[in-house]
Amino acid sequence: SEVEYRAEVGQNAYLPCFYTPAAPGNLVPVCWGKGACPVFECGNVVLRTDERDVNYWTSRYWLNGDFRKGDVSLTIENVTLADSGIYCCRIQIPGIMNDEKFNLKLVIKPAKVTPAPTRQRDFTAAFPRMLTTRGHGPAETQTLGSLPDINLTQISTLANELRDSRLANDLRDSGATIRGSSDYKDDDDKHHHHHH
């Protein structure tokens, strides 16, 4: 099952995806698509990187992490209910059957409407428990529900990112675990890739 992430209408949504470059600067092409990962490539591509930069994106989709270190987490700006659904992060490792693919489920909730306060605003009521992930802007928050187990493959940097952020504590609180898996590997076209 997909890992589920939540955001409110009007917020920025954050969908994490990481890999470890074989060497500094040795980037791997990555694509993000709307919809579950197909056999090849990404369907409905919203953003793509190559060996040097972000070379394709559509409005509201961008990378706010250090993609040159393998943080290819997707930010979706100012989400609407229509942004709900499955997103595919595909790490296009050169060679046959080497691609890593991750399906992430984004759930968008209607924005909370709070009555105009007569006195001081009650921030606890207006803003439920949120977390801001390290290295991302203040508007980029993810409302914590009960997070399911995270089913990702051999990507050690995710654990490092989690350990470095407040998310680690929140994941521990929710009982989530990080499991390795090999069932996401697939056959894919060969990709031209150079070391640099």
């Epitope: 500094p24 600067g25 040097r52 930069d53 994106w57 961008w62 250090d66 040159r68 270190k69 640099h196």
Partner: antibody
Framework: QVQLVQSGAEVKKPGASVKVSCKAS????????MNWVRQAPGQGLEWMGD????????KYNQKFKDRVTMTTDTSTSTAYMELRSLRSDDTAVYYC??????????????WGQGTLVTVSS | DIQMTQSPSSLSASVGDRVTITCLAS??????LAWYQQKPGKSPKLLIY???SLADGVPSRFSGSGSGTDFTFTISSLQPEDIATYYC?????????FGGGTKVEIK
């Protein structure tokens, strides 16, 4: 230490071509993109394109793609930038520069001293 | 192409003043902004990369902040040797583009 040493100043007539060289030392030449950036007198910086020496793959700024060719000679760790069909507004200082993550993810950023190319009839 | 709009184009400040330069990207560029210093007749020198990271050997009075589209470069206490033109550059998507520059002078 890392050094990028460029060829000397050139004066060219409109319509001619110029080839600027950039000799690298002090690092593994094939590991980093070599960029070319120009600066017209009193103006800002403009990226022209880059090349990765290990396979010759290059990417050019659309503005220059029909007139520029970037090459490398890995045996001498030298990069070249040739600009054709020169016009007076190509008068500028041309820099080679290399940047990117190096070992331990330390950012690597070095520039040549610049080559003044003057286009005048 | 991503446009980088830098402001102000020039400023004059006194030694010891705090100096702030802003750079606005036409589209989000994540953290991939660099700041360069260029003195007359010299090559650009990297000060900040990845929006906030100080390049090797650069004094700590220089700092950068921001992500997405809005970035700020700060000199906490202006020194006479800081007289130069400063450029921002995006390294998110090629063609890499530079801001128009900010010339910093001493009052």
């Amino acid at each position: 230490q890392v050094q990028l040493v460029q060829s000397g100043a050139e004066v060219k007539k409109p319509g001619a071509s110029v080839k600027v060289s950039c000799k690298a030392s002090g690092y593994t030449f094939t590991d980093y993109y070599m960029n070319w950036v120009r600066q017209a007198p009193g103006q800002g910086l403009e990226w022209m394109g880059d090349i990765i020496p290990n396979n010759g793959g290059s990417k050019y700024n659309q503005k220059f793609k029909d007139r520029v060719t970037m090459t490398t000679d890995t045996s001498t760790s030298t990069a070249y930038m040739e600009l054709r069909s020169l016009r007076s507004d190509d008068t500028a200082v041309y820099y080679c520069a290399t940047w990117g993550y190096g070992s331990s993810y330390r950012w690597f950023d070095y520039w040549g001293q610049g080559t003044l190319v003057t286009v005048s009839s | 192409d991503i446009q980088m709009t830098q402001s102000p184009s020039s400023l004059s400040a006194s030694v010891g003043d705090r100096v702030t330069i802003t750079c606005l990207a036409s589209q989000p560029i994540g953290i991939w902004l660099a700041w360069y210093q260029q003195k007359p007749g010299k090559s650009p020198k990297l000060l900040i990369y990845a929006a906030t990271s100080l390049a090797d050997g650069v004094p700590s009075r220089f700092s950068g902040s921001g992500s997405g589209t809005d970035f700020t470069f700060t000199i906490s206490s202006l020194q006479p040797e800081d007289i130069a033109t400063y450029y921002c550059q995006q390294l998110y998507s090629s063609p890499w583009t530079f801001g128009g520059g900010t010339k910093v002078e001493i009052k």
